[in-house]
């Protein structure tokens, strides 16, 4: 008689990602019965909401369960029926949502209401949605992948089984960039962290971190190109602004009032003598990349060392993973090769910024222009901050890997979200039992 | 940017039907999901049925049953089968997309069409 395949013992876990530019849910899985151990977790799906992020249908918070629909309907398809009940659901709302809630607690609560009631329509173990701190966001970042990474394991390998590990068990830095916010999380190396609001302590596998993490708030890439044009229209004569971090021959119309929406651009709030302005592109690396130093204010500091806008931040120390929009930028520009230096990264940034735009735009026919007409900022924007606001040097940019996966799981905080609500990260180290662990069975 | 043009109104008794069209000047395949709404004189754009890019549709419920969503993204189009019309349904009708896409955050379908007027009487 032919032998019986046994019912995989497995667990699934849905988290979904709702940022500022776009949502996206993704499906974790792991086996039952090794729930403890490091490493098991990955990823089997991701589904990319179309559309904006939720904090854009507060005047529309009907819409947002039609909008979550389809990708909500793929995890039904992709998790066994018999396991629904049982997966447990998280929604994590990050910067997008902490800029509403500024401005409005009351639409804040509305919008993440009308989240909670959709997502409880389906047949899944629902747990709530909630906006995350910058705090949290950058420490299960870090958490993610120095789990994928195999950072927090204590067996010790002859063989490199991921990616960038080096034997010693040094864990990475995390950086991470959204559309509104941006993330810094390391462990320094023998370093007070001279302000109690950067410091997380974290007992892991039975070791204990001290680590450094910081959230800037407006400085994600859509947020800081909305403070650099209010900067800019500040002192432009007339309602053309000539702007460096487009292509050469770009127009684009930009209504005022979209420009003072956000509470990013609240600093430079001005009354203008005109309603729109056009932006038209003049391609310059360098001009650009002068422009965005402008929202940095390094002229103060409290600490012995400051990042910018007089935040603490530790000498850097070890390896880092940039993740998210520092990887989805800098894979579209080329530039995430472990070979490719700063210096030619910035040389490659200037040609880019300096194609005229009908160049540009055959060159990616494929490419939303939308988007396509952001990348020079985008890119200059990057090595702005890298570089001038968090202190990386020629030198240790070989440190900085850029990272979109690990073992086919993304590299983002939601991993290390569930890992953590699910209780799977335990603070000692799991004895391990007979078979666990064995090379065969 | 994408144009939306309504088409297929009229005038109806109550009990008859209609079919609305609307047809984008772009690609909709992209888009998240499609809606119709409707204003009535003096009242707020309401959402009355909606399809997503993977085909799930939702509806009022004071149009349950009776409405029925479809898209043909080969042909850029939305449609509204209103059978069982009342005169409660009499409004401006108008198609969108839902959520849209941003550029820096700005919500670029929210340009809206004429619409096309739908009248239920007898």
């Known amino acids: 008689t032919q032998n019986k395949a046994l019912p995989e013992n497995v667990k699934y876990g849905i988290v979904l990602d709702a940022g500022s530019s776009h949502t996206s849910l993704y499906i974790y899985k792991w086996p039952a019965e090794k729930e403890n151990d490091t490493g098991v977790v990955h990823q089997v799906e991701e589904c990319r909401v179309k559309g904006p992020g939720i904090s854009k249908f507060v005047q529309k918070v009907n819409e947002i369960g039609i909008y979550l629909t389809d990708c909500m309907e793929r995890a039904r398809e992709v998790i066994p029926r018999s396991q629904h009940q049982e997966t447990p659901v998280y929604l994590g709302a990050t910067a997008g949502m902490r800029l509403l809630r500024m401005e409005s607690e009351e639409l804040a609560d509305r919008v993440l209401d009308v989240v909670e009631r959709s997502l409880s329509n389906y047949p899944f173990d629902f747990q709530g949605a909630r906006i995350i701190t910058g705090q949290e966001e950058g420490a299960y970042g870090w958490i993610t992948i120095n789990y994928l990474l195999g950072k927090f394991s204590q067996k010790t390998r002859w063989f490199s089984i991921v990616p960038y590990e080096t034997n010693n068990q040094e864990t990475f830095g995390a950086l991470d960039l959204g559309g509104a916010s941006t993330q810094v999380t390391f462990v320094p190396q023998n370093q007070t962290i001279e302000s109690p609001d950067n410091a997380l302590q974290f007992r892991l596998y039975g070791k204990d971190y001290n680590v450094y993490t910081h959230s800037f708030l407006c400085y994600g890439k859509d947020q800081a190109l909305w403070q650099k044009l209010a900067k800019d229209i500040q002192v432009a004569s007339n309602e053309i602004l000539r702007d460096p971090c487009f292509h050469p021959g770009y127009k684009k119309v930009v209504n005022v009032s979209d420009l003072y929406k956000t509470p990013c651009t609240k600093r430079f709030e001005m009354t203008l003598p005109f309603q729109q302005f056009e932006i038209q592109g003049i391609g310059n690396y360098q001009q650009c990349h002068q422009s965005i130093l402008e929202l940095f204010n390094t002229s103060y500091c409290p600490y012995s060392q400051c990042a910018f806008n007089g935040i603490f931040l530790p000498p850097l120390q070890g390896d880092f993973g940039a993740f998210s929009a520092f990887y989805f930028v800098m894979k579209f520009l080329n530039l995430t090769s472990e070979k490719v230096s700063q210096e030619k990264v910035t040389e490659m940034m200037k040609k880019f910024c300096a194609q005229p735009w009908e160049e540009i735009k055959t060159s990616y026919a494929g490419v939303k222009e939308k988007y396509l007409s952001e990348y020079c900022f985008s890119g200059t924007y990057i090595l702005s901050l890298l570089l001038q606001g968090y202190h990386f040097t020629a030198d240790s940019w070989e440190h900085i890997h850029f990272i979109g996966k690990i073992q086919g799981s993304d590299a983002g905080w939601t991993l290390g979200y569930m890992l953590n609500l699910t209780n799977m990260i335990p603070a000692e180290q799991p004895l391990s039992t007979p078979l666990s662990h064995s090379t065969y069975v | 940017q994408v144009q939306l043009v309504e088409s297929g109104g009229g005038s109806v008794q109550p009990g008859g039907s209609l079919k609305l069209s609307c047809a984008a000047s772009g690609s909709i395949s992209s888009i998240n999901a499609m809606g119709w709404y409707r204003q009535a004189p003096g009242k707020q754009r309401e959402l009355v049925a909606a399809?997503?890019?993977?085909?799930?549709?939702n509806y009022a419920d004071s149009v349950k049953g009776r409405f029925t969503i479809s898209r043909d993204n080969a042909k850029n189009t939305v449609y509204l089968q209103m059978n069982s019309l009342k005169p409660e349904d009499t409004a401006v009708y108008y198609c969108?997309?839902?959520?849209?896409?941003?550029?820096?955050?700005?919500?670029?379908?929210?340009?809206w069409g004429q619409g096309t007027q739908v009248t239920v009487s007898s």
């Open positions: 399809i997503t890019s993977g085909g799930y549709t």
């Open positions: 969108n997309a839902i959520g849209g896409s941003t550029w820096f955050g700005e919500d670029e379908y929210d340009n």
